[in-house]
Amino acid sequence: AITEAREEAKPYPLFPGPFPGSLQTDHTPLLSLPHASGYQPALMFSPTQPGRPHTGNVAIPQVTSVESKPLPPLAFKHTVGHIILSEHKGVKFNCSISVPNIYQDTTISWWKDGKELLGAHHAITQFYPDDEVTAIIASFSITSVQRSDNGSYICKMKINNEEIVSDPIYIEVQGLPHFTKQPESMNVTRNTAFNLTCQAVGPPEPVNIFWVQNSSRVNEQPEKSPSVLTVPGLTEMAVFSCEAHNDKGLTVSKGVQINIKAIPSPPTEVSIRNSTAHSILISWVPGFDGYSPFRNCSIQVKEADPLSNGSVMIFNTSALPHLYQIKQLQALANYSIGVSCMNEIGWSAVSPWILASTTEGAPSVAPLNVTVFLNESSDNVDIRWMKPPTKQQDGELVGYRISHVWQSAGISKELLEEVGQNGSRARISVQVHNATCTVRIAAVTRGGVGPFSDPVKIFIPAHGWVDYAPSSTPAPGNADPVLII
């Protein structure tokens, strides 16, 4: 039968016969050796079931005395098999063995759940020598037991390369229930069922679970641990916890908040990072995500110029990195920009709208209908054109750049003229006679120089020729832009 020593019980007599009746006597041992080692033991729970101590190993000595009497088999004496006590209490237990004096250097080691206990434990070995035998008492004490001290403890002694093992002493630390699984915070869809799990262990068992929602018990009857609570659905945030009860009392889990997923709050602080003629780089600070991760965002761009149509463009982008370059915009235009983001529930409202402007750009088209003719009387070349459509000027026209290239007998030189924006004609002096003059014109804004028109060529004859018709930009479809009149 298992002997149980409850914490309030007196120590059992360990040594009937010639040995002292208990450790509390005044008999002083000749030698007291604490276990010496620098290691802190790893304490593990015992897989061995309490209540089933195994018989310790027995070593039969081969050595005989002078009279050749065989020595009795060596074995640890039986001791208490099962100690039950509360957390934070102290405990002390012993192993004892009588060893013939012919054996030298015997040491006893303590083991817990198959692992040797090294180091900073209160393990003391006491030796009581007699004529023929030495009584060895190994005691092990724990000043404040914890659950991790639960397990099966044994003593081992090595003699003649034989190992002598004591019966196990099962330490069972009882206390308030201990949670191995507590409910977790969750974000749930409104009116959708979800589960919460709570698990607690003793000893002592059984452990019973009560669920608490917003400070009120959910279940009238307790459930054995582990317990799964199925909540049919919530319409507003709630706090859940579980109570674990055993014979020692109750432990309450952490309270966990169950949030209801909602549409996100609108983004804030939409700001302009950079503007060009045809693009605007914006950033924003996301609003509260409504307890559900953002999926993507929508940038809404509305023409804001007083006479604009107010056309709306919508650009979808990923939720990260809270940055987007809006493209395909008109130059020198005003836009209202708003940002909205979505999670699994839906779209947020639009952020406060901000006003942004594109800058001037270089014109996107060249001047139209370029015409060139020779005014021989003044020895000038007259150039005429039509300004590009306003929409494609991409800014306020500040003037035109005229390129005229003169080619004669292998010599070529290019000259550039800048003319103001007023009017659409220019006059350049003839640079070389008996040469070809090639003219191209580009519109200029503060944003830069636009593309040059297709080249228009005119032949400048030697002095004395008369009457010259104009050369002009060819009509669309005309493959040859060279007109020599």
């Epitope: 509305k302 110029d305 006479l307 149509n309 709306v312 929409k391």
Partner: antibody, heavy 114, light 107 residues
Framework: QVQLQQPGAELVKPGASVKVSCKAS????????IHWVKQRPGQGLEWIGR????????NYNQKFKGKATLTVDKSSSTAYMHLTSLTSEDSAVYYC???????WGQGTLVTVSA | ETTVTQSPASLSMAMGEKATIRCITS??????MNWYQQKPGKPPKLLIS???TLRPGVPSRFSSSGYGTDFVLTVENMLSEDVADYYC?????????FGSGTKLEIK
């Protein structure tokens, strides 16, 4: 084709209010500004304000703030102008116009008379 | 607020003549000026939009010019169907403001 339909006339008493409607068709209602313009008999044109159906954002001429309130009903593609505390000064033709004033309603004559 | 001064208030032209209507703005509005024609009992009709752009379907005898603060609407070869009120509308800044109008008549 683009159309802006307005009721022909509204007769209201001084101090009362009136809600002038402008039903749009032939285009995407939420994509363009709708403007409101006042024209008193034999007089010139005055801009009251504009509203964007996409987000119901209005811009008002300061002169008409407190007098006119612009709203839209996206489900019926209709813009409204609510005029309050009417006096004889408010007797006029009120036009709604689309986008850059390329399309106009036929106008609603509001007559304020006891 | 940008004010628009339109002149003349009325203009009487013989058939085939050229009519010129001027609008001057109190602030620089770039090229953002619209021109409208209104006939009695009808809503205004957009003739020319910002950037001196002639609207589709509008006869080419109508043209406009100007940039900044000074704008002109020209009607070449006056026809009887051109008898109407003409308004300019500045779109440089809110609030939008119309010119006071010009009544164009046949002599």
């Amino acid at each position: 084709q683009v159309q802006l339909q307005q009721p022909g006339a509204e007769l209201v008493k001084p101090g009362a209010s009136v809600k002038v409607s402008c039903k749009a068709s032939g285009y995407t209602f939420t994509n363009y500004w709708i403007h409101w313009v006042k024209q008193r008999p034999g007089q010139g044109l005055e801009w009251i304000g504009r509203i964007h159906p996409f987000d119901s954002e209005p811009n008002y001429n300061q002169k008409f703030k407190g007098k006119a309130t612009l709203t839209v009903d996206k489900s019926s593609s209709t813009a409204y102008m609510h005029l309050t505390s009417l006096t004889s000064e408010d007797s006029a033709v009120y036009y709604c116009a689309l986008a850059s004033f390329a399309y106009w309603g036929q106008g609603t004559l509001v007559t304020v008379s006891a | 607020e940008t004010t628009v001064t339109q002149s003349p208030a009325s203009l009487s032209m013989a058939m085939g003549e050229k009519a010129t209507i001027r609008c001057i703005t109190s602030t620089d509005i770039d090229d953002k000026m619209n021109w409208y024609q209104q006939k009695p009992g009808k809503p205004p009709k957009l003739l020319i939009s910002a950037g001196n752009t002639l609207r589709p379907g509008v006869p080419s005898r109508f043209s406009s010019s100007g940039y900044g603060t000074d704008f002109v609407l020209t009607v070449e070869n006056m026809l009887s169907e051109d008898v109407a009120d003409y308004y300019c509308l500045q779109g440089g800044a809110l609030p939008l403001t119309f010119g006071s109008g010009t009544k164009l008549e046949i002599k």
